[in-house]
């Protein structure tokens, strides 16, 4: 496992829940979708049932203001995003409740959340050069950017 | 066209074993759990369990504990359910049925496997 | 686990009927309710998801409600192609537990 970053050494407290049942596309058009129970993956899909509705939770942070730590959650389930290495996919992982607090280890469930007009980035707390990211029939994992795709669209208010 | 074939009808006698396949073609087999259904004669569905097609990870209901296993060929998109010991009791239709999770959170079965009938007797 | 309980095990209608069946769940699910329909020898088939969606090619007549514990699959004019055995399935948590079934049939 790469090491921590300094920012593990933080403290991060829950704020509240900032975004309900939201699907994540990239720039290739495709939804981030449910793989074999703890993976996520991304596809071109016809329905948009299929795609996986998020919850976003924000934390505080006391560093930089421009970037929100935000958990990640499947709606309606215990289940959270959580970074590992490089290359490797996101897992979701069950927890009871949302953290209150958050530190050490538990920064693989922390993102920072950038917007740039209607792109999203999602940059692991735990490694922060690595980004959520996206390959052509592949799992969602961590990357530096291309040739994965570190950009999303957040879609709300689907039906 | 997403499809999958199951092997061939099997008589079987008491104690013996038998194993049945299941191809899948038409989508990404690692992306789809691949879940297993038993229906007894007369009977209705009763859920398996089902082996996790990336990791090869299987999870079984209770009542498939012990003398059930699942197991993968990847690469020819094959899941096999291998059933030892056999008994008149699991005299049965047993089906594959792909996984699929609609919102990431809801469990349903969207394809199923045309059913290899098991029958035990000595 | 989550036991399913199914109701009616069989029932008999006409042509033309509204046809209810129910499915009560042994805890709170949360919308994750699937039906099924398996015509005599043949495979099961998804029809419903998450209560209420239709599966591509299902036809309209066939709906479903619900929430919490307890769900109803409704046909709304009962279809002579309609003569099968309808499952529910909860969807929330393995073991994926179904109903024990609904055998449906023409008066």
């Known amino acids: 496992s790469a090491p921590f970053s300094f920012l593990s050494n933080m403290t991060y407290h829950f704020i509240r829940i900032i975004k309900h049942e939201f699907i994540l596309n990239d720039t290739l058009n495709q939804t981030i979708i449910r793989a074999n129970d703890q993976y996520l993956t991304a596809a071109a899909i016809h329905n948009l049932d299929e795609a996986v509705k998020f919850d976003m939770g924000a934390y505080t942070s006391s560093k930089d203001d421009t970037k929100v730590p935000v958990i990640l959650r499947i709606s309606k389930t215990q289940l959270y995003v959580s970074a590992q290495d490089e290359d490797q996919p996101v897992l979701l992982k069950e927890m009871p409740e949302i953290p209150k607090t958050i530190t050490g280890s538990e920064t693989n469930f922390l993102f920072f959340w950038e917007t740039h007009g209607t792109k999203n980035y999602f940059i692991s707390v735990a490694h922060p050069n690595l980004f959520i990211a996206t390959k052509h029939d592949n799992w969602v994992c961590l990357a530096k950017g291309l040739p994965s795709i570190t950009d999303f669209q957040i879609l709300e208010n689907q039906a | 066209e997403i499809q999958l074939v199951q092997s061939g009808a099997e008589v079987k006698k008491p104690g013996a074993s038998v194993k049945v396949s299941c191809k899948a073609s038409g989508y990404t087999f690692a992306h789809y759990g691949m879940n297993w259904v038993r229906q007894a004669p007369g009977q209705g569905l009763e859920w398996m369990g089902w082996i996790n097609t990336y990791t090869g990870q299987s999870t079984y209901a209770d009542d498939f504990k012990g003398r059930f296993t699942f197991t993968l060929d990847t690469s020819t998109s094959t899941a096999y359910m291998e059933l030892s010991s056999l008994r008149s009791e699991d005299t049965a239709v047993y089906y594959c049925?792909?996984?699929?999770?609609?919102?990431?959170?809801?469990?349903?079965?969207?394809?199923w496997g045309q059913g290899t009938t098991v029958t035990v007797s000595s | 686990d989550i036991q399913m309980t199914q109701s009616p095990s069989s029932l008999s209608a006409s042509v033309g009927d509204r046809v209810t069946i129910t499915c009560r769940a042994s805890?709170?699910?949360?919308?994750?309710l699937n039906w099924y329909q398996q015509k005599p020898g043949k495979t099961p088939k998804l029809l419903i998801y998450y209560t209420s969606r239709l599966r591509s090619g299902v036809p309209s007549r066939f709906s479903g409600s619900g929430s919490g514990t307890d769900y109803t699959f409704t046909i709304s004019s009962l279809q002579p192609e309609d003569i099968a055995t309808y499952f529910c399935q909860q969807g929330k948590k393995p073991p994926y537990t179904f109903g024990q079934g609904t055998k449906l049939e023409i008066k």
């Open positions: 805890q709170d699910i949360s919308n994750m």
């Open positions: 049925a792909r996984g699929i999770y609609y919102f990431g959170s809801n469990y349903a079965m969207d394809y």
